[in-house]
């Protein structure tokens, strides 16, 4: 009678993380007597997959009933596939031996691998706030692929970004892998509500590149510019000066009078104007008694904007340039009169 | 599973034509979808595909010749101005569950003749 | 775009033999690469993907080997049957893009 023969008639095969794995083996023979077993790898290090007589491998089963008298197939299935069970896999038929059994023939081994989705892009942005044409640095993320063949772009508004870098890793063959990229934006006054996409295509995705994002409005930081005017008023003896912040980001900002560089009054942003490109715009007031005032006075708008250093503009309130005719007495009363803003 | 072509017929040059594949026992928001063509005596070629959220992607000669669109249980294939060039036997097919790289299941395809 | 140079286009073997189909990418596709089936007025019919994986159904007479810009496609104990046209199909992962070889021509005396 012919030598019994272990056939496994899968060179290789592919399987989904979170699928089934059916491994085909067939022998040729009854005879010896004595159990098979599966192992994934060769060599003294083999991983024991299944074992006939004894052991709990709760993921594998067998394809055919292993009891049966005259059984020859000793297919398994492994349940929930993940990229760790890629391997090649060998059906090996052992003698019947006391006290051990004696290992005999072996089958020539299938390729298991495993094709896994990428997990979503994660984008993070820097930690602190930039200013318009600074440069700034957006990484990108995703884990869990296989194979390792991925591509990876960045884009900003639709238009794609030329100035990154991306690594995956491992380098060398991994169950798994993980791609990581770091692009250069430069930020301008109208990013607001620009939007930095990272975008990866792999092999298992059936839809549109999986897409990761971060909002500039997170990352940018649009310093106000600061107008101050003065206007008459029908009161006599009164003008108003006003403060106008324009095209600032994001809302936080603490507005400051100064009269003759001594504080007059604070008051914090609270009615602002939003601006299309996404700023804001907000206008401080001040009702002027020049008749309390004997000389020159220089009034100051001083504005703290999101936690940054004080920027301020002033203006010379000239007392003699306000004769009676246009309302100026020298009546007393207060300097200042209180303002609300507009 | 199986997908099958329909609207082949004998056509004009510059007349447009539209062909459709019908899928059963999958659906198509899971799977991206593609078109070729195979001319009498010659081998396959690739049109273009769509993905399972409808974006159509198209080969580099295709130049907007043709357009693939999908609705949720067919996709279609409009040749926007047909040559003689354009005479054919139009396959669809879906891509295999493990990824975009291959295609497991065509139709039989479906004819189209374009002629003066 | 990637060519896909395959050959022969023609290829006769009896019964029983062997037949090698070799297809040559114009660069590297990473193992994305499928052959099919086609016999005359019939559609494609997968029989290998990734290289060396068998379609489900597919008999284990059928091998596909290869990595790189190299691929085999290699049909053993040739039967009758087995007369058709063989296509390679590539995937660059880069291009997202599909192409084919020319198609080999397998005639079974």
């Known amino acids: 009678e012919e030598e019994l023969q272990v056939i496994q008639p899968d060179k290789s095969i592919s399987v989904a993380a979170g699928e089934s794995a059916t491994l085909h083996c067939t022998v040729t023979s009854l005879i010896p007597v004595g159990p098979i077993q599966w192992f994934r790898g060769a060599g003294p290090g083999r991983e024991l997959i299944y074992n006939q007589k004894e052991g709990h491998f709760p993921r594998v089963t067998t394809v055919s009933d292993l009891t049966k008298r005259n059984n020859m197939d000793f297919s398994i299935r492994i349940s929930n596939i993940t990229p760790a069970d890629a391997g090649t896999y060998y059906c090996v038929k052992f003698r019947k031996g006391s006290p051990d059994h004696v290992e005999f023939k072996s089958g020539a081994g299938t390729e298991l691998s495993v094709r896994a989705k990428p997990s979503a892009p994660v984008v993070s942005g820097p930690a602190a706030r930039a200013t318009p044409q600074h440069t700034v640095s957006f990484t990108c993320e995703s884990h869990g692929f296989s194979p390792r063949d991925i591509t990876l772009k960045w884009f900003k508004n639709g238009n794609e970004l030329s100035d990154f870098q991306t690594n995956v890793d491992p380098a060398g063959d991994s169950v798994s892998y993980s791609i990581h990229s770091t692009a250069k934006v430069v930020l301008t006054r109208e990013d607001v509500h620009s939007q930095v996409i990272c975008e990866v295509a792999h092999v298992t995705l059936q839809g549109d590149p999986l897409r990761g994002t971060a909002n500039l409005s997170e990352t940018i930081r649009v310093p106000p510019t600061l107008e101050v005017t003065q206007q008459p008023v029908r009161a006599e003896n009164q003008v108003n000066v006003t403060c106008q912040v324009r095209k600032f980001y994001p809302q936080r900002l603490q507005l400051t009078w100064l009269e003759n560089g001594n504080v007059s009054r604070t008051e914090t942003a609270s009615t602002l104007t939003e601006n299309k490109d996404g700023t804001y715009n907000w206008m401080s007031w001040l009702l002027v008694n020049v008749s309390a005032h004997r000389d020159d006075v220089k009034l100051t708008c001083q504005v703290e904007h999101d936690g940054q250093p004080a920027v301020s503009k002033s203006h010379d309130l000239k007392v003699s340039a306000h004769p009676k005719e246009q309302g100026s007495n020298t009546a007393p009363g207060p300097a200042l009169a209180s303002a609300a803003p507009l | 599973q199986s997908v099958e072509e329909s609207g082949g017929r004998l056509g004009t040059p510059g007349t447009p034509l539209t062909l459709t594949c019908t899928v059963s026992g999958f659906s198509l928001s899971s799977y991206v979808m593609g078109w070729f063509r195979q001319a009498p005596g010659k081998g396959l070629e690739y049109i273009g595909i769509?993905?399972?959220?409808?974006s159509p992607y198209y080969a580099s000669w295709v130049n907007g010749r043709f357009t693939i669109s999908k609705t949720s249980t067919t996709m279609d294939l409009k040749m926007n101005s047909p040559t003689t060039e354009d005479t054919a036997t139009y396959f669809c097919a879906r891509v295999g569950p493990l990824g975009v790289d291959y295609f497991n299941i065509w139709g039989p395809g479906t004819l189209v003749t374009v002629s003066l | 775009d990637i060519v896909m140079t395959q050959t022969p286009s023609s290829v006769e073997a009896a019964v029983g033999g062997t037949v090698t189909i070799k297809c040559q990418a114009g660069q590297s596709i990473n193992s994305y690469l499928a052959w099919y089936q086609q016999k005359p007025g019939q559609r494609p019919k997968l029989l290998i993907y990734y290289a060396s994986t068998l379609e489900s159904g597919v008999p284990s007479r059928f091998k596909g080997s290869g990595s790189g810009t190299d691929y085999t496609l290699t049909i053993s104990d040739l039967e009758s049957a087995d007369a058709a046209t063989y296509y390679c199909?590539?995937?660059?992962?880069?291009?997202?893009?599909?192409?084919f070889g020319g198609g080999t021509e397998v005639v079974v005396k």
């Open positions: 769509i993905s399972s959220s409808g």
């Open positions: 199909q590539s995937w660059h992962y880069i291009s997202r893009s599909y192409a």
